[in-house]
Structure formats: C-alpha cells, structure tokens
C-alpha cells in the first residue's frame, strides 16, 4: 500500500530513508534538457524475496534533441562528483536498515538524473530526520517518522525533533554535533529530497481535482 502523503515537514530539517521497503518506487526523472528515453521506464521498483531485494528497471535519460538515442546509465566519475548526493550519514540511524530483509539500498545515480529524487513510499517505511547546517537538534524522542495504515488511511507519525539555531547551547549528553544537510541547502530551502505519492497509472482513482473560478479581476 502506497503512502498518500509526504512525511511531515520539520522546520530546518531534512529527512532521508536509510533503506527502502519492497514496493517503493523511484521516478525516472531527468535534469533539464534531458528526457526519459522513448518508452523507457517510468520508475524503478524495489522488489525481491525474503533473502534479497533489488531495484527493478533502469532509468535512462537522453538529450531532448535526440530523444530516441539511449544514453549510458552509469555516470562518469566527474558527473558523480557534481551530482548532489542523496546519502545522509546520520547518527540517528539505529541499525543498518539497508541490510534488513525486504529492503533496497539507495539506488545508484543514472546519467543526467534530476537533482532531486521523487520516491513513492509504502506503508511501513521509516525516514530519519536531521537538522540542516547551522541548526542543532533538540530531541524529545525519536527523530523518525513511519508511514502507518490506520482505519484504511495512511499517515506518517510525527517525528520528535526540534531544530534550533542556538549553536552555543550545550548539547544533550552523547548527542553528536549537528551535521550538514545532505544537500548543503540554505535554511530558506529546507524542502526535502524525497516526496511521495500514489504513482500508479489508473483511470479510476480516488483522486479529485476541482476546477473553479478562483477570483475574477476586472481590468
């Protein structure tokens, strides 16, 4: 079951999944000037059995001018260096979730991938939060959120984390110093790398879009 919403937003914090549950989808998005190859995969899918999980499908991008030409999926070393990483080395990670059965690791980058990844999480997915650079964590509890199914609807639990700009205040015992945001973003751009939604193509979906005249201006 896919989660209906994004994980909660915490001011001055970003979130990251350390591993992805089977059923998670990752959009095949390309950076500007590049597009998904003709009839190429729309998404990567975490699949597997009890002993091994991996990402099905490959994302491939091609120059908009030559869309029917397939590009290599493995980035060159210099491209990997330039690309914003989605990894988050975090002291908040209690276990190596990537080694858990039924989970996939972060997929490797593909050539000309968009700078932000759009994930579609499933029920049971856990994401971890940490404060962006310049902010320190005040923990009231776990700095994590889990997508849960309640009464037939999905919801994310609220992470117990506050990020404060008071760098001088003493740290909690055993608390590590705050680390840089994985994106190195200024605090004015604390939107997260990963977003979620129901990705399936369907013609009869529980979505509504109401178009209306919002305001009328006479000029």
């Amino acid at each position: 079951e896919l989660c209906d919403d994004d994980p909660p937003e915490i001011p001055h914090a970003t979130f990251k999944a350390m591993a992805y549950k089977e059923g998670t989808m990752l959009n095949c998005e390309c950076k500007r000037g590049f597009r998904r190859i003709k009839s190429g995969s729309l998404y990567m899918l975490c699949t597997g059995n009890s002993s091994h999980s991996s990402w099905d499908n490959q994302c491939q991008c091609t120059s908009s001018a030559t869309r029917n030409t397939t590009k290599q999926v493995t980035p060159q070393p210099e491209e990997q260096k330039e690309r914003k990483t989605t990894e988050m080395q975090s002291p908040m990670q209690p276990v190596d979730q990537a080694s858990l059965p039924g989970h996939c690791r972060e997929p490797p980058p593909w050539e000309n991938e968009a700078t932000e990844r759009i994930y579609h999480f499933v029920v049971g997915q856990m994401v971890y939060y940490q404060c962006v650079q310049g902010y320190r964590a005040l923990h009231r509890g776990p700095a994590e959120s889990v997508c849960k199914m309640t009464h037939g609807k999905t919801r994310w639990t609220q992470p117990q984390l506050i990020c404060t700009g008071e760098m001088e205040t003493s740290q909690f015992p055993g608390e590590e110093k705050p680390q840089a945001s994985p994106e190195g973003r200024p605090e004015s751009e604390t939107s997260c790398l990963v977003t979620t939604t129901d990705f399936q193509i369907q013609t009869e979906m529980a979505a509504t879009m109401e178009t209306s005249i919002f305001t009328t201006e006479y000029q």
């Epitope: 998005e29 597009r35 029917n68 369907q202 979505a207």
Partner: antibody, heavy 108, light 107 residues
Framework: PGRSLRLSCAAS????????MHWVRQAPGKGLEWVAV????????YYADSVKGRFTISRDNSKNTLYLQMNSLRAEDTAVYYC??????????????WGQGTLVTVSS | YVLTQPPSVSVAPGQTARITCGGN??????VHWYQQKPGQAPVLVVY???DRPSGIPERFSGSNSGNTATLTISRVEAGDEADYYC???????????FGGGTKLTVL
C-alpha cells in the same frame, strides 16, 4: 474581452507536490488544446504559443492548488479548461488524470 | 509539430477499429492516446505507444513507427463510441501537442 480571470484547481487523493500539472482547454465542439504545464516544484513552466505572455500557470503545494491567471482575454479563449495531472514530476509526457473542467466564456 | 488524425472512423460492433495519428518521424516520439466521451473529461487509454493503464481493457492497443502511430480497438463495443486523441511532447518547442481528434462511430 480584455479582462482577467484566475482559475484554480484543488487537488486531493494524491500527493500534489510530486506531480507536474497541466492546463488543457477545449473550445465548444472542438478538440483538445494544451495550454500550459508546471513542474512539481514550480521551477519549470511551459506555455502554448497562443497564450504565452497572457496566461501564467502557478501552484501552491502547501494548499494542493494549481492556478491559471488569464489576462487580456479574447473571445477565442472561450473553452472548457481542464486541470490535469502528469504522470511524472517533470516529465511532461503523460497526462494520466483529468479534472472535470470548468467553462470559461469570454464575450462582450 | 503537427499531428494529423482522420476526423471520423466507423466500425461495426465486434469488428476492429484502427485510428491513425500522423506526424513527421512520429516513431521517434512516445505517443499517448485519450478517449473522451460526450460531456466527460478525457481518459488515458494507451501511453508510451503501446502500454495500457490499469483498468483499460486489453482490447485497446497501440503501435508506432515511421510517420504513423495507430490506436487499435478490437472487438469494438457500443461503449467505445467516443472521440480519440493522440498526443506527444515536442521537445523542440517544449510543447504538448494533441492531434485534432477522431470520432469513432459504432454502427
């Protein structure tokens, strides 16, 4: 003619902020005409030549709402306007879900 | 970029309907097809030339090569009567382009 109008599209049932969104219109008795598209985060916008410079597409992800600001309206802008969802966040390829549409009539 | 569709196609129930969409080297582009019944919003029936969304019957299929894309509806039913539109993304202009539409009449 010459006046302005703002359309809004309230989306629900999916994570609005993950999808590119389109406006497509259909004049009475005519075919579909694409108007504009905006990427999931609002960073990229593209317009049909017929509306470029007059219409502006925008979105408020915190309100799950898509907008179309229409200025300098002409009689030929009379149509049913559909709000529609793209399959990807910035793919602009496949329109997989459409709103029910709203009729805009421009007349003197 | 221009997509050309025949204005109308007629077919008897149970027969096969083929609706074409012509465009310069359209085979190099991904083509998507929409069905629109009177008074309703369009519905995606085929994407990426030949893939079907969930909920769309197997009777709907597509192909695309050269300068022509084709939507094929086998074992046509009365409920298939509608307007059908092809669509592509034109990378040279950064525009979505629709064909003019084809009215399918089930005799």
């Amino acid at each position: 003619p010459g006046r302005s109008l703002r359309l809004s599209c309230a989306a629900s049932g999916f994570t609005f902020s993950s999808y590119a969104m389109h406006w497509v219109r259909q004049a009475p008795g005519k075919g579909l005409e694409w108007v504009a598209v905006i990427s999931y985060d609002g960073s990229n916008k593209y317009y049909a030549d017929s509306v470029k410079g007059r219409f502006t597409i925008s979105r408020d992800n915190s309100k799950n709402t898509l907008y179309l600001q229409m200025n300098s309206l002409r009689a030929e802008d009379t149509a049913v306007y559909y709000c529609a969802r793209d399959l990807l966040g910035s793919g602009y390829d496949i329109i997989d879900y459409w709103g029910q549409g709203t009729l805009v009539t421009v007349s003197s | 970029y221009v997509l050309t569709q025949p204005p109308s196609v007629s077919v008897a129930p149970g027969q096969t309907a083929r609706i074409t969409c012509g465009g310069n080297n359209i085979g190099s582009k991904s083509v998507h097809w929409y069905q629109q019944k009177p008074g309703q919003a369009p519905v995606l029936v085929v994407y990426d030339d030949s893939d079907r969304p969930s909920g769309i019957p197997e009777r709907f299929s597509g192909s695309n090569s050269g300068n022509t894309a084709t939507l094929t509806i086998s074992r046509v039913e009365a409920g298939d009567e509608a307007d059908y539109y092809c669509q592509v993304w034109d990378s040279s202009s950064d525009h979505v382009v629709f064909g003019g539409g084809t009215k399918l009449t089930v005799l």
